[in-house]
């Protein structure tokens, strides 16, 4: 499911449950995706020893995964709501090609991988409604994405395992940073 399920049964029974605000909806959506990533990471870590590899060893890759930097305005020092929101949306749009790559990488968690991808699309829509400066958001070039996807899929098994692990780890870090920043707004 692209959107987290409704409140559990005991919550539904609660009288006068108020609808979620825009902030609550975004927060919940990010947490839903992070739970999905957690499940995917579990399968990846059970399948290969990538999770034991040091951060330094894994950093030696030429994947251009989105990452938060000081200039993006999403950290405590130099926090800027508008700049940060643009960075979060741009970053999520850039992650989409990597999430597409993940689609054929899981056996028992195939549905979970699809849910993470679809939920991210929904999250982007929620955030775009919140952003005032949509002009500053650059959408990745589809042709570039298509060739990147082909290149990633042509890697040997070991590199594909590492790529999967790196995407999940980077996406988790990006979303956690986004969650913290959005809660400050």
């Amino acid at each position: 499911a692209p959107v987290p399920p409704g409140e559990d049964s005991k919550d539904v029974a609660a009288p006068h449950r108020q609808p979620l605000t825009s902030s609550e909806r975004i927060d919940k959506q990010i947490r839903y995706i992070l739970d999905g990533i957690s499940a995917l990471r579990k399968e990846t870590c059970n399948k290969s020893n990538m999770c034991e590899s040091s951060k330094e060893a894994l950093a030696e890759n030429n994947l251009n995964l989105p990452k938060m930097a000081e200039k993006d305005g999403c950290f405590q020092s130099g926090f800027n709501e508008e700049t940060c929101l643009v960075k979060i949306i741009t970053g999520l749009l850039e992650f989409e090609v990597y999430l597409e790559y993940l689609q054929n990488r899981f056996e028992s968690s195939e549905e979970q991988a699809r849910a993470v991808q679809m939920s991210t699309k929904v999250l982007i829509q929620f955030l775009q409604k919140k952003a005032k400066n949509l002009d500053a958001i650059t959408t990745p070039d589809p042709t570039t994405n298509a060739s990147l996807l082909t290149k990633l899929q042509a890697q040997n098994q070991w590199l594909q395992d590492m790529t999967t692990h790196l995407i999940l780890r980077s996406f988790k870090e990006f979303l956690q940073s986004s969650l913290r920043a959005l809660r400050q707004m």
Epitope: T21, S23, E24, D27, K28, R31, L34, D35, S38, F75, Q76, F79, E81, Q176, R180, L182, R183, Q184, M185
Partner: antibody, heavy 117, light 107 residues
Framework: VKLQESGGGLVQPGGSRKLSCAAS????????MHWVRQAPEKGLEWVAY????????YYADTVKGRFTISRDNPKNTLFLQMTSLRSEDTAMYYC???????????WGQGTSVTVSS | DIQLTQSPASLSASVGETVTITCRAS??????LAWYQQKQGKSPQLLVY???TLADGVPSRFSGSGSGTQYSLKINSLQPEDFGSYYC?????????FGGGTKLEIK
Amino acid sequence: VKLQESGGGLVQPGGSRKLSCAASGFTFSRFGMHWVRQAPEKGLEWVAYIGRGSSTIYYADTVKGRFTISRDNPKNTLFLQMTSLRSEDTAMYYCARSNWDGAMDYWGQGTSVTVSS
Amino acid sequence: DIQLTQSPASLSASVGETVTITCRASGNIHNFLAWYQQKQGKSPQLLVYNAETLADGVPSRFSGSGSGTQYSLKINSLQPEDFGSYYCQHFWSTPWTFGGGTKLEIK
């Protein structure tokens, strides 16, 4: 860093009260803020949170629809407007500063609210 | 809602001892967890956030660890000033609930 709550006192059930928290010693507008309460001889209960720009606001289910958290950044003040008060709202109310991760790194001394007829 | 279960509810220990307090969440809270100390009649004080990051000015005898649903606070070589109540709190999904608390008393 100093946080000073005020506005507590004795209130009738169904009544209203507005608590204030005066902040000093830090740039107030750069931090999210929380209200937390503690009933006599009981544990801590998170009440509400407000982001630095007030666009992110969260409440505990027990106070949603009755309490309103707000802030005045130029005046370095946090507020908690409480309405439809019940006896179970009797507690010491603390304001606390949120660090970047949401945890409460500085707390006020608290202001006591008693709801009783 | 995520529930936090702290254990033990109370414990007695002597100065110099090592104690561990645990906090179990009803769901994965992804390390979005803090620990506080509160002394009788005083405001709480932050000890640890992000499950394992020590807050500024907190002595190194305190340490936090854990992941997923299981977290703990360890106090090495208890000092007289360490006695009081300890609470865990999560920041995963609202409401950002506290655990029920652990009262640490001098034996």
